[in-house]
């Protein structure tokens, strides 16, 4: 797994370094995640052929990922940092769910789908600390999550694997515009 | 060619119990989720467990109707399912399938062995 | 859980008809557009046996004249032309989710 964000050897080797702002810390924390992502994705896709599946079959799913939309207020065109902030990790909230059924998924990676996990739920951390509004922020209920989990853990083998395919994929795609909303604010 | 042998069946008193064993060949058995369903005049098909080993990691599922009474296991150096069934009941009778789960979903099955709860 | 309701529980065809068996999921079994049907021909004293998969998919040496078709939650069997050999039991089963179910049956004789 690789190294967490703040304790790299650059860091060691440079102790008189600024330390990092609370902007550079997230931006820092959104790349390591998309590095583990990226390293997940590499496992599932030697595994089985999800990843030359058409965008028409994942389109047609029927799990309610996160997904950057215009009304969001995170793309260039209408941007508004504090609605953007609060999709960002109401985003990230819901996304947990899914990344909790992604834990057994992996053989190699196990590790790497640990680390993904847990320095997602530090990002939410700094971010909650960013924004301003927190009551605009909702928290998925865990009743309905416990029960999503069941249904996503009982799907036949094929199923499992396009929905790896498919979280990995949403998930890497909601961080990539939640980084570029972020270095707007 | 997929084959399934089911052995153990036959006559139980009520609260009793049986195991069932079932011997697969034809295919790469350890990658498979293995299953025990059975068939009974009154019921029809009904599933009963499922094993499934998922990135070295064993998840097991029972129907309701026997949780806490049957349980699944395997041995994949024997490439074998077995189902050990405790405090059996009159509606446990029927016919138990050894059935693999593949990939994409559907079944293949055994020829069955018949378990009759009686007194 | 997914509960499958089919119909009709009984039917009798001449030779050389077409019979049809529908089958209602109470949910959809269908994700990433494939639907998870299967369908089980079942002759006295015998396992079942697979004739359609992924509600269109043939099993292997099963003969042309058996075809599946719907989707999300109607789906239904086609024998055609029927011939003497087809008189069984036929169920259909969700592969979707764990708890794999099964409809109640539906006996087909020759008329």
């Known amino acids: 797994a690789p190294v967490p964000p703040g304790e790299d050897s650059k860091d060691v080797a440079a102790p008189h370094r600024q330390p990092l702002t609370s902007s550079e810390r997230i931006d820092k924390q959104i790349r390591y995640i998309l590095d583990g992502i990226s390293a997940l994705r590499k496992e599932t896709c030697n595994k089985s052929n999800m990843c030359e599946s058409s965008k028409e079959a994942l389109a047609e799913n029927n799990l309610n990922l996160p997904k950057m939309a215009e009304k969001d207020g995170c793309f260039q065109s209408g941007f508004n940092e504090e609605t953007c902030l609060v999709k960002i990790i109401t985003g990230l909230l819901e996304f947990e769910v899914y990344l909790e059924y992604l834990q057994n998924r992996f053989e190699s990676s196990e590790e790497q789908a640990r680390a993904v996990q847990m320095s997602t739920k530090v990002l939410i951390q700094f971010l909650q600390k960013k924004a301003k509004n927190l009551d605009a922020i909702t928290t998925p209920d865990p009743t309905t999550n416990a029960s999503l989990l069941t249904k996503l853990q009982a799907q036949n083998q094929w199923l499992q694997d396009m929905t790896t395919h498919l979280i990995l994929r949403s998930f890497k795609e909601f961080l990539q515009s939640s980084l570029r909303a972020l270095r707007q604010m | 060619e997929v084959k399934f042998e089911e052995s153990g069946g036959g006559l139980v008193q009520p609260g009793g119990s049986m195991k069932l064993s079932c011997v697969a060949s034809g295919f790469s058995f350890s990658n498979y989720w293995m299953n025990w369903v059975r068939q009974s005049p009154e019921k029809g098909l009904e599933w009963v467990a499922e094993?499934?080993?998922?990135?070295?990691?064993?998840?097991?599922y029972y129907a309701e109707s026997v949780k806490g009474r049957f349980t699944i296991s395997r041995d994949d150096s024997k490439s074998s399912v077995y189902l050990q069934m405790n405090n059996l009941r009159a509606e446990d009778t029927g016919i138990y399938y050894c059935a693999s789960l593949f990939y994409d979903g559907y079944l293949h099955w055994g020829q069955g062995t018949l378990v009759t709860v009686s007194s | 859980d997914i509960v499958l309701t089919q119909s009709p529980a009984s039917l009798a065809v001449s030779l050389g008809q077409r019979a049809t068996i529908s089958c209602r999921a109470s949910e959809s079994v269908g994700n990433f557009g494939i639907s998870f049907m299967n369908w089980f021909q079942q002759k006295p004293g015998q396992p079942p046996k697979l004739l359609i998969y992924t509600a269109s998919n043939q099993g292997s040496g099963v003969p042309a004249r058996f075809s599946g078709s719907g989707s999300g939650t109607d789906f239904s069997l086609n024998i055609h032309p029927m011939e003497e050999d087809d008189s069984a039991m036929y169920f259909c089963q969700q592969s979707k989710e764990i708890p794999w179910t099964f409809g109640g049956g539906t006996k087909v004789e020759i008329k």
């Open positions: 094993i499934r080993l998922t990135s070295n990691k064993q998840a097991i």
